[in-house]
Amino acid sequence: EPPTACREKQYLINSQCCSLCQPGQKLVSDCTEFTETECLPCSESEFLDTWNRETRCHQHKYCDPNLGLRVQQKGTSETDTICTCEEGLHCMSESCESCVPHRSCLPGFGVKQIATGVSDTICEPCPVGFFSNVSSAFEKCRPWTSCETKDLVVQQAGTNKTDVVCGPQDRQR
């Protein structure tokens, strides 16, 4: 009796269970009563990453330098090429088809997480006691200067954008 379902890594065709092609290989011919499934390796610029019955391998992704991309991991017959962005850029989307410059954190904000090839800069507002007076993709919020430790007094209070201004203690008292 012809099968209606097949084992794992097999497929049903012409009332027969045929072996799927292993990752890195494409289907040349289905099996018959007299022959096995025939598979062929993908060429150097192609891949298939699953057990399959594909008659064509997929092309490796191209990391286009004009879009700010570079190769992070070269593709094999079983894996696609992984692209990442050049220094100072990050992926625009999860599929990383193009890159955009990292965002800078404005004065009053510091870098919570430095950007990577795949994620943008994460900024956070400087809390009380901290400030950032620059627009930067690297600088964290810095703590206000401690005037006391320098035997000085606060002459001008700090803000989220400015440091405190310290001055000498008033000795006329």
């Epitope: 072996s19 040349v28 011919s29 289905d30 018959t32 009563e33 007299f34 022959t35 096995e36 025939e38």
Partner: antibody
Framework: QVQLQQPGADLVKPGASVKMSCKAS????????ITWVKQRPGQGLEWIGD????????KYNEKFKSKATLTVDTSSSTAYMQLTRLSSEDSAVYYC?????WGQGTTLTVSS | DVLMTQSPLSLPVSLGDQASISCRSS???????????LEWYLQKPGESPKLLIY???NRFSGVPDRFSGSGSGTDFTLKISRVEAEDLGVYYC?????????FGGGTKLEIK
């Protein structure tokens, strides 16, 4: 019904080449491998090679690799086997087959 | 290459008798997928071979149930339970598990 039609006979001179045909009908040619087999007079069967009409993929018996070339013309549903540098040793009946169905065979005589 | 050895070379039988033909391979012919492509063919005088059994035990459509195939690994057998006149001819085993595919030398079934 499945049929593999081969010419009955061919007479060629030593040193020449011959291209034998095998016309398939009654099924989709591209789904089955075509097998070629040699049988010398009064002798047994010898596997020459196989071709898959869908992909053009071939398997050869090493012994026949420099003697036989298998091809297919899917537009005419015909498989071909070309034999080169013929000698009397090549005089035989040559069958094409789908394994479950066989052609009637072409009798090749190599003689001057 | 896998050598297929058939025995006996000639098998004289009386009509209605059981006949048994042995085929031994020089190495295990289970392929990498776990399948054994062992076939049996009958060739009558002046005709092309006809498939009887494929994959060791499977009877080809239209083949009478008096024909049965068995075996595994390196030892295979074709049995004809009650020989009829139309069964006479040369029987060949054939392995298509390991390239190059190979035929046995043949067993001639004849009347005693």
């Amino acid at each position: 019904q499945v049929q593999l039609q081969q010419p009955g006979a061919d007479l060629v001179k030593p040193g020449a080449s011959v291209k034998m045909s095998c016309k398939a009908s009654g099924y989709i040619l591209t789904t089955y491998w075509i097998t070629w087999v040699k049988q010398r007079p009064g002798q047994g069967l010898e596997w020459i090679g196989d071709i898959h009409p869908g992909s053009g993929s071939t398997k050869y018996n090493e012994k026949f690799k420099s003697k036989a070339t298998l091809t297919v013309d899917t537009s005419s549903s015909t498989a071909y086997m070309q034999l080169t540098r013929l000698s009397s040793e090549d005089s035989a009946v040559y069958y094409c087959a789908r394994r479950d169905y066989w052609g009637q065979g072409t009798t090749l005589t190599v003689s001057s | 290459d896998v050598l297929m050895t058939q025995s006996p070379l000639s098998l004289p039988v009386s009509l209605g008798d059981q006949a048994s033909i042995s085929c031994r391979s020089s190495q295990n012919i289970v392929n990498s997928q776990g399948n054994t492509y062992l076939e049996w063919y009958l060739q009558k005088p002046g005709e092309s071979p006809k498939l009887l059994i494929y994959k060791v035990t499977n009877r080809f459509s239209g083949v009478p149930d008096r024909f049965s195939g068995s075996g595994s690994g390196t030892d295979f057998t074709l049995k004809i339970s009650r020989v009829e006149a139309e069964d006479l001819g040369v029987y060949y085993c054939f392995q298509a598990s390991l390239v190059p595919w190979t035929f046995g030398g043949g067993t001639k079934l004849e009347i005693k």
